[in-house]
């Protein structure tokens, strides 16, 4: 019989519903298992006006190393903020920079991805390896990108609809589920039912859905149903703060005793068949009914009790409400500038307005030195001669001020101006790990140490080595030692840092062929970064320094010729 | 099956300038781009340039930048390359190929190829 | 512009013979893509990521390399390879071709 019950949207303060999924518009994965670079590529849609992403990156330790390089290519078609985490990876990342602002310096090496369409984006990207994964992601909040995982049958990544990433991707949708919900009419009580389907996915591996569930109710106000449909290789791990009647497809297990698997029921799969499941259990309200794609975690909130639904009369908001100003984001959003002889401060309006910040000022330390209004930003600039700048042997600083409507204090942030004229980077070789007494001749089979310092020292920048390689001439040829901030092989090591933090590294060289080379030329780039700050103000530089080479050894590791 | 169907041989005037077409089947045409290779006789291959047919975004061999002009009609997924000033050094074979990103980019498919003669 | 250079230009080996061929680049590159073109036929993608067999390829034929040399190796020469073999390479722009290697039966 017909269950008469008409499903109507819920008020997001009834109950949302959030998910993480690895189902895509769009996608691929492949294994690329001998390739130099794994390469992934993202193509992120998001609704006008600027969008806040997470993004993380992450990779498990393989045979006790740190996995290949990775290229990852990001695609945006508006203005994101982007909170990048990618500790401990070697990462290129290739992006628009015009559309992307990292939320903090990503402290990883970046190219700028040309405007291609899509097509020429994967071919850009091809062209620099094969690609392990693509995908097609529509206003992600959150993106979870785990490297060395391809599970892909497939030996190339060619975009298809409707793809399952598995565990190489899972992303949060922005956008929370539409959650329904309705009176089930003739049933007394107050009983009410929370209605889950999951909807099957590209493909059909086991898969375990992790459901947390939290009712904003006194624990004996509730007489509860939980009703979980999906398509039978999911199993569901629930993790719920309120006793109620689980009914579920395929195996269940609780968080607190998860080793503890309880068969379900066959269920209906059509949102009919479900509604009378929940009348049949004894349910008078559908609380909220939620259908979602295959996801690896579902979070329902909801705040029912089993009184009174209120289903919302019009069309709802599905994105949750903006937070009030957060004056911290907002003075990270303040770039610098420096060129000229001159410092400039740069706060684009978009951003600002995102925030849902109102600026009345925003000035240097000098309160006469006030920011231009240029109609899409503000523009603050001086010399290095006035507006209270400080000036040092290595550096010009100053203060931003901003004054924002909703604090009664102005924020204040510091921001300096590397002095190039007066920085001198040096390459130092040592022969021993005390790093005591510099050298310039290399022994092949013998140990060498490299230190790279920049004087006068900068406190409030990072000295970082993105790559260095040893030229050996024609003979020779070239041995990378490092590569984007990565040893190179297992003949290099990167040390810890000097007490002034100046980066190290070891090498070992040996020769399997003769003539052995009697001079090289060690060159490395080098990069000071600010410790926090935009990543406008890095600052490269190559550095060189010849090397003599004695006494030949046929033995053992770098091998070149 | 993909196809890219080339237009036939062509003996043309020294200083004269001459179209050919490239009409492909068999596949989406906005996923991939379209490339032009020349051959002289005998010699190895020239890339001269690619187009996209999603925008008719073109991308050329700065040697080829005054001589050729690529151009699509979606409607018919045709590819043309238009060539002007001919001289004898444009006597030629001209494959068009189809680029694929999961073969690394690679050209997967090629035209027949159109032989071209430039004589007085 | 990246000039690769194939040796040798011309080259004839017997039925059952391994063979290699060269392509060298005048700068590092990170991947070559092989090339198979019949008298009067057009090129086919026979090799793509130096060492990936494209569909239908021969599992005799194999490539290797790195840098800025690489090869294209025949287990044991059969027929229907009599070929003119290009190398070629797509990581610096403008894409570039090498000069052929031409390989007859013995």
């Known amino acids: 019989e017909t269950v008469h019950c008409d499903l109507q949207p819920v008020g997001p303060e009834r109950g949302e519903v959030t998910y993480t999924t690895s189902q895509v518009s769009k996608g691929c994965v492949a294994q690329a298992p001998n390739a130099i670079l794994e390469v992934h590529v993202l193509f992120l849609e998001f609704p006008t006006g600027p969008s806040q992403l997470e993004l993380t990156l992450q990779a498990s330790k393989q045979n006790g190393t740190w996995p290949r390089e990775v290229l990852l290519v990001l695609s945006v078609n508006s203005s994101v903020f982007l909170h990048l985490q990618a500790l401990g990876i070697p990462l290129h990342l290739a992006y628009n920079s015009s559309l992307v602002t990292f939320q903090e310096p990503p402290g990883v090496n970046t190219t700028e991805l040309p405007s291609f369409p899509k097509t020429q984006i994967l071919e850009w990207a091809a062209e620099r390896g094969p690609i392990t994964s693509a995908a097609e992601l529509n206003d992600p909040q959150s993106i979870l990108l785990r490297l060395g995982q391809a599970q892909g049958s497939l030996s190339f990544c060619m975009l298809e609809a409707s793809q399952d990433m598995g565990r190489t991707l899972e992303w949060r949708p922005r956008t929370p589920a539409l959650v329904r919900g309705c009176h089930l009419e003739g049933v007394a009580g107050h009983k009410e039912a929370h209605i889950l389907r999951v909807l099957p996915g590209h493909s059909a591996g086991p898969r375990t859905v992790t459901v947390k569930v939290e009712l904003s109710c006194a624990p004996g106000d509730l007489d509860a149903v939980l009703i979980l449909q999906g398509p039978p290789y999911v199993s569901w791990l629930i993790d719920a703060n309120h006793n109620m009647q689980i009914w579920t497809t395929g195996e269940y297990s609780f968080k607190i005793f998860p080793e503890k698997n309880i068969r379900g029921f066959k269920l209906p799969d059509t949102p009919q068949g479900l509604l009378g499941e929940a009348r049949m259990l004894n349910a008078s309200i559908v609380a909220s009914f939620v259908e979602l794609p295959l996801a690896s975690i579902v979070s329902l909130h909801a705040s029912s009790c089993g009184g009174r639904l209120q289903t919302s009369p019009a069309p709802i908001q599905t994105t949750p409400p903006k937070d009030t100003c957060s004056p911290e984001l907002l003075m990270s959003l303040i770039q610098t500038k420096c060129a000229d002889d001159a410092m400039t401060l740069v706060l684009k309006k978009e951003l600002v307005a995102h925030l849902k910040c109102t600026i009345t000022g925003l000035t240097f330390w000098d309160p006469s030195c006030e920011a231009e209004d240029r109609g899409d930003k503000f523009v603050l600039r001086s010399a290095y001669s006035s507006c209270g700048m400080q000036v040092s042997a290595s550096m010009i600083s100053n203060e931003a001020v901003v004054n924002i409507l909703s604090s009664s204090s102005p924020q204040r942030k510091k921001v300096h101006c590397l002095n190039m004229d007066s920085l001198s980077f040096q390459l130092g070789l040592y022969l021993s790990p005390h790093f005591l007494q510099a050298s310039n001749t290399i022994e092949p089979g013998q140990q060498s140490f490299v230190q790279v310092r920049v004087s006068p020292s900068v406190s409030e920048f990072l000295l970082q080595l993105d790559s260095c390689h040893l030229d050996l001439g024609p003979e020779g040829g070239t041995v990378e030692l490092i590569q984007g901030r990565a040893a190179k092989g297992n003949c290099v090591s990167l040390l810890s840092p000097s007490p002034e933090g100046d980066p190290r590294f070891s090498f070992l060289l040996h020769f399997y062929t003769v003539p052995i080379p009697k001079t090289g030329t060690l060159s490395c780039t080098v990069a000071l970064r600010p410790k926090t700050g935009s990543q406008d103000q890095e600052v490269h530089r190559t550095v060189f320094m010849r090397l003599n080479i004695i006494s030949p050894d046929l033995s053992g590791c770098t091998s070149k010729g | 099956e993909v196809q890219l169907e080339q237009s036939g041989p062509e003996v043309v005037k020294p200083g004269t300038s001459v179209k050919i077409s490239c009409k492909t089947s068999?596949?989406?045409?906005?996923?991939?781009?379209l490339h032009w290779i020349k051959q002289n006789q005998g010699k190895s291959l020239e890339w001269i340039g690619g187009?996209?047919?999603?925008?008719?975004?073109?991308t050329y061999r700065q040697k080829f930048k005054d001589k050729a002009t690529l151009t699509v009609d979606k409607s018919s997924s045709t590819a043309f390359m238009e060539l002007r000033s001919l001289t004898s050094d444009d006597s030629a074979v001209y494959f068009c190929?189809?680029?694929?990103?999961?073969?690394?980019?690679?050209?997967?498919?090629w035209g027949q190829g159109t032989t071209l003669t430039v004589s007085s | 512009e990246n000039v690769l250079t194939q040796s040798p230009a011309i080259m004839s080996a017997s039925l059952g013979e391994k063979v290699t061929m060269t392509c060298r680049a005048s700068s590092s590159v990170n991947y070559v893509y092989w090339y198979q073109q019949k008298s009067d036929a057009s090129p086919k993608l026979w090799i793509y990521?130096?060492?990936n067999l494209a569909p239908g390829v021969p599992a005799r034929f194999s490539g290797s390399g790195s840098g800025n040399s690489y090869s294209l190796t025949i287990s044991s020469m059969e027929g229907e390879d009599a070929a003119t073999y290009y190398c070629?390479?797509?990581?610096?722009?403008?894409?570039?071709f090498g000069g052929g290697t031409k390989l007859e039966i013995k």
């Open positions: 187009i996209n047919f999603d925008n008719g975004g073109t």
């Open positions: 990521y130096t060492s």
């Open positions: 068999g596949y989406t045409i906005t996923e991939h781009t």
């Open positions: 190929a189809r680029r694929a990103y999961y073969y690394g980019s690679a050209f997967d498919y």
């Open positions: 070629q390479q797509f990581i610096s722009f403008p894409y570039t």
